[in-house]
């Protein structure tokens, strides 16, 4: 049975140009994790892997950091950036756990106007 | 669809370095899901896991090889590399390329393979 | 490192009968992380299942994998004459490394 639960920022914002964390974290369950999956819509951003650890993704490795812990940093923001990210946790015996995050990447002058960070 | 072919030496001399590429076609080694290994079968026995490598340059190797074995990346050429040093004849084996799914976790295996090249071991 | 036995060593059985394959851990291996390879004289091996039970692309649905824990079985319902070959089982873990079995031998009756 799955009793865990993924605990996320939410809707978030950010100016382009900029960076932001994303971040999961995964409570109420004493499974094993073996790995973190971080995707937006159906791309492959980045990999955590229990044993092997960080692992970005071809078309993201210049912009995109591991960590911190097992959240992600993404930089030199753009407006495509906007959507949703997805952490995937897979966990043992437990199986998978998903995560989704919103972000809105707003041109500087409205970005400063808003709130940065915005959890529903 | 994406092919694997293993290139070297088909004769090393004991205590020399075998070294073989592995030559990726039909898509790119730049996968972010994928490592790409190396396996061995000596003649007539079983297979055996040599090391893998991520296009990045991360690697993880049998335990029992690692001390003399080192496996490189080059993503300008779609190829990744195994040396192995201080043969002797128990080398003697069909070396394979593969592409190894470690990450892909619920499908963990090695999906698709070289044909193999046979490496002797002698003086 | 985590020892893959499998049984019966050779197999002698006729086209149409049905194969079943054994393959034992010396620990507990996540049946998301085994695998099931058939190779034939001068090839390279090939993935017929993985994840203990789904069918790699291409495979015929008599190949059929089941099992968890240390106990693991590869079955093929009827044998067709392009199925005689050696057949392993591997174990993907990372620590301790990944492993093959020693194999099992399908030949003709």
């Known amino acids: 049975m799955m009793t865990g639960t993924i605990e996320t920022t939410g809707n978030i914002s950010a100016e382009k140009g900029g960076s932001i964390i994303l971040q999961c974290h995964l409570s109420s369950t004493t499974a094993q994790v073996t790995q973190v999956n971080w995707e937006q819509q159906d791309q492959l951003l980045a990999i955590c892997n229990a044993d092997l650890g960080w692992h970005i993704s071809p078309s993201f490795k210049d912009r995109v950091a591991p960590g911190p812990g097992l959240g992600l940093t993404l930089q030199s923001l753009t407006v495509n950036d906007t959507g949703e990210y997805f952490c995937i946790y897979h966990t043992y015996p437990d199986g998978t756990y998903t995560g989704r995050i919103f972000l809105e990447v707003l041109e500087s002058s409205v970005a400063e106007h808003g709130a940065r960070f915005q959890i529903p | 669809q994406l092919q694997l072919q293993e290139s070297g030496p088909g004769l090393v001399k004991p205590s020399e370095t075998l070294s073989l590429t592995c030559t990726v076609s039909g898509g790119s080694i730049e996968s972010g899901s994928y490592y790409w290994g190396w396996i061995r079968q000596p003649p007539g026995k079983g297979l055996e896991w040599i090391g893998s490598?991520?296009?990045?340059?991360?690697?993880y190797y049998n335990p029992s090889l690692k001390s003399r074995v080192t496996i490189s990346v080059d993503t300008s050429k779609n190829q990744f590399s195994l040396k192995l040093s201080s043969v002797t004849a128990a080398d003697t084996a069909v070396y394979y390329c593969?592409?190894?799914?470690?990450?892909?976790?619920?499908?963990?295996?090695?999906?698709?393979w070289g044909q193999g090249t046979m490496v002797t071991v002698s003086s | 490192e985590i020892v893959l036995t499998q049984s019966p060593g050779t197999l002698s059985l006729s086209p149409g009968e049905r194969a079943t394959l054994s393959c034992r851990a010396s620990q507990s291996v996540s049946s998301s992380y085994l695998a099931w390879y058939q190779q034939k004289p001068g090839q390279a091996p090939r993935l017929l299942i993985y994840?203990?039970?789904s069918r790699a692309t291409g495979i015929p649905d008599r190949f059929s994998g089941s099992g968890s824990g240390t106990d693991f079985t590869l079955t093929i319902s009827r044998l067709e004459p392009e199925d005689f070959a050696v057949y392993y089982c591997?174990?993907?873990?990372?620590?301790?490394?990944?492993?093959f079995g020693g194999g099992t031998k399908v030949e003709i009756k």
């Open positions: 593969a592409r190894d799914g470690v990450l892909t976790l619920n499908k963990r295996s090695f999906d698709i």
């Open positions: 591997q174990q993907h873990t990372v620590r301790p490394p990944l492993t």
């Open positions: 994840g203990a039970s």
């Open positions: 490598i991520y296009y990045s340059g991360g690697t």
